[in-house]
């Protein structure tokens, strides 16, 4: 828990320099995000792929979208969950994080020193050992989070399914009801590739508690998607007389000495002229 | 046909409690989420809070957080309202009813009759 | 929480008269909903996403609008039609009625 109060931002006094006054974990072990190069990468042959259970949520069912004042985010069911880590972990939120239109370059991981335009986290608690994410989030082994690199290109009609309802929430504390779609569509291709490494949570109280699994692959939205979401949103209420734009809600890559991100696949990716692999 | 039927309404003490039942038939119970909603004498509609059957879930307007308390039991298809520090404004017939998703959100295609609670001494 | 303001409060009207019921919301919704209330009976099922009519529902009624404003005409009012309307919103949490509108008998 903070020291005092739970005020904390991406930008000025309260920035992330200042977290760890208040949330001491942010200056301690295993923080995240990291970038991802070469030299601290090493193949494990034991990364199996992950199974997404109940990842297609009917649209008969309602699930709350949040402005927090620090990203937007979905409430997800507890009976969606990941099969194939060593416990059963499941769902509680998404929530994504990006830069702004000047410099659309966005993502918490980067891999070898380039940011991506935005990032994805699907967050999940380890639901064998306790009863919800709050109590999880500060036990060893307690939450795994799935990220996806996310860049500019096509339009995602997937992530519009959120974008859509941004309207809805744009200023902190407002909610919104977004239909259920399959989650599982947010994902990028080849699920099977991904990073694994412990880490911590990127946000105040960065507590030292996630499995993370990087997707190697990227996902594509539209620039007018990359866009809606770095111009639709602030992290102020509604009534503030100082509006702030939530944009570059991204926490620096932080330092990661001496430790290695295991990979579920051998690291050569060599594309010929004719595109094979 | 699919029926939602309320019960356990009735007079109660202020700062007393209720505890009210929604039991469902004739679709896929864990399928659709279950939503409560009151309406005192002579006034509008305002919803409450629901919850997701299938896993238990729940959602609540801010106004009655900490106040309702909604629960299922799968094996009977019905679900509860628990609410608490009853007030007389509480005085409210509850209905509770099922929404239906037809393309971009929902709308309340079933409801159950109502069942009258009366908070009073 | 999005305010939703019915107007008139309450009408008087014959049978055979063209009757409109207004909906405001305090902030931009993207559809609104309408139901229909007997006394002593629970809502029933109207108009959805503002000009779709329910299976069952008359064709004298219709609906219209967008952003903050709704509306739900009867074209030719009916003695069954008497009752009260209410709207509502889905697009942001809490969902919020309209304190209703009653159609009565002149």
């Known amino acids: 828990a903070p020291v005092n109060g739970s005020k904390w931002t991406y930008f000025g006094p309260d920035g992330e320099n200042s977290w760890s006054k208040k949330y001491p974990s942010c200056g301690g072990l295993l923080q995240s995000p990291i970038d991802l190069h070469s030299d601290i990468l090493q193949y494990d042959a034991s990364l199996t792929p992950l199974e997404f259970q109940g990842y297609n949520l009917s649209a008969n069912k309602q699930f709350l979208l949040t402005n927090n004042g620090h990203s937007v985010k979905l409430n997800l069911p507890s009976d969606m969950h990941i099969q194939g880590l060593q416990s059963r972990y499941s769902a509680t939120q998404l929530h994504l994080h990006w830069g702004n239109p000047n410099d659309p370059h966005g993502s918490e991981h980067t891999v070898s020193g380039q940011h991506f335009a935005a990032e994805l986290h699907i967050v999940h608690y380890n639901s064998d050992l306790y009863p919800d994410a709050s109590t999880a989030s500060n036990k060893s082994e307690g939450l795994a989070v799935l990220a996806v690199l996310i860049e500019m290109g096509s339009f995602n009609p997937s992530y519009d399914k959120i974008f859509s309802h941004l309207q809805h929430v744009k200023y902190k504390g407002q909610e919104a009801f977004v239909p259920g779609f399959n989650i599982e569509e947010l994902l990028p291709e080849r699920t099977a590739e991904y990073y694994r490494y412990r880490g911590s949570l990127t946000t105040p109280p960065c507590n030292p508690t996630v499995l993370w699994t990087v997707f190697r692959n990227p996902v594509q939205i539209s620039q007018e998607q990359l866009l809606a979401l770095e111009t639709a949103l602030y992290c102020t209420h509604m009534d503030d007389p100082s509006p702030r734009e939530m944009i570059n809600n991204f926490r620096q890559v932080q330092k990661f000495d001496e430790r290695l991100v295991y990979t579920s696949f051998s690291q050569v990716q060599v594309c010929t002229a004719a595109g094979l692999s | 046909e699919v029926q939602l039927v309320e019960s356990g309404g009735g007079l109660v003490q202020p700062g007393g409690s209720l505890r009210l039942s929604c039991a469902a038939s004739?679709?896929?119970?864990?399928?659709?989420?279950i939503y409560w909603v009151r309406q005192a004498p002579g006034k509008g509609l305002e919803w409450v809070g629901y919850?997701?059957?299938?896993?238990?879930?729940?959602t609540y307007n801010q106004k009655f957080k900490g106040r309702a308390t909604i629960s299922v039991d799968k094996s009977k298809n019905t679900a509860y309202l628990q609410m608490n520090s009853l007030r007389a404004e509480d005085t409210a017939v509850y209905y509770c009813?099922?929404?239906?998703?037809?393309?971009?959100?929902?709308?309340?295609?079933?409801w159950g009759q109502g069942t009258l609670v009366t908070v009073s001494s | 929480d999005i305010q939703m303001t019915q107007s008139p409060s309450s009408l008087s009207a014959s049978v055979g008269d063209r009757v409109t019921i207004t909906c405001r919301a305090s902030?931009?919704?993207?559809?609104m909903h309408w139901y229909q209330q007997k006394p002593g009976k629970a809502p029933k099922p109207w108009i959805y996403?503002?000009?779709h009519l329910v299976s069952g529902v008359p064709s004298r009624f219709s609906g219209s609008g967008s952003g903050t404003d709704f509306t739900l005409t009867i074209s030719s009012l009916q003695p069954e039609d008497f009752a009260t309307y209410y709207c509502?919103?889905?697009?942001?949490?809490?969902?919020?009625f309209g304190q209703g509108t009653k159609v009565e008998i002149k």
């Open positions: 009813s099922r929404p239906i998703y037809y393309g971009a959100y929902w709308y309340f295609d079933v």
């Open positions: 004739g679709y896929s119970y864990t399928d659709y989420n």
């Open positions: 919850i997701d059957p299938a896993n238990g879930d729940t």
């Open positions: 902030s931009s919704v993207t559809y």
């Open positions: 996403a503002t000009s």
């Open positions: 509502q919103q889905w697009s942001s949490n809490p969902l919020t």
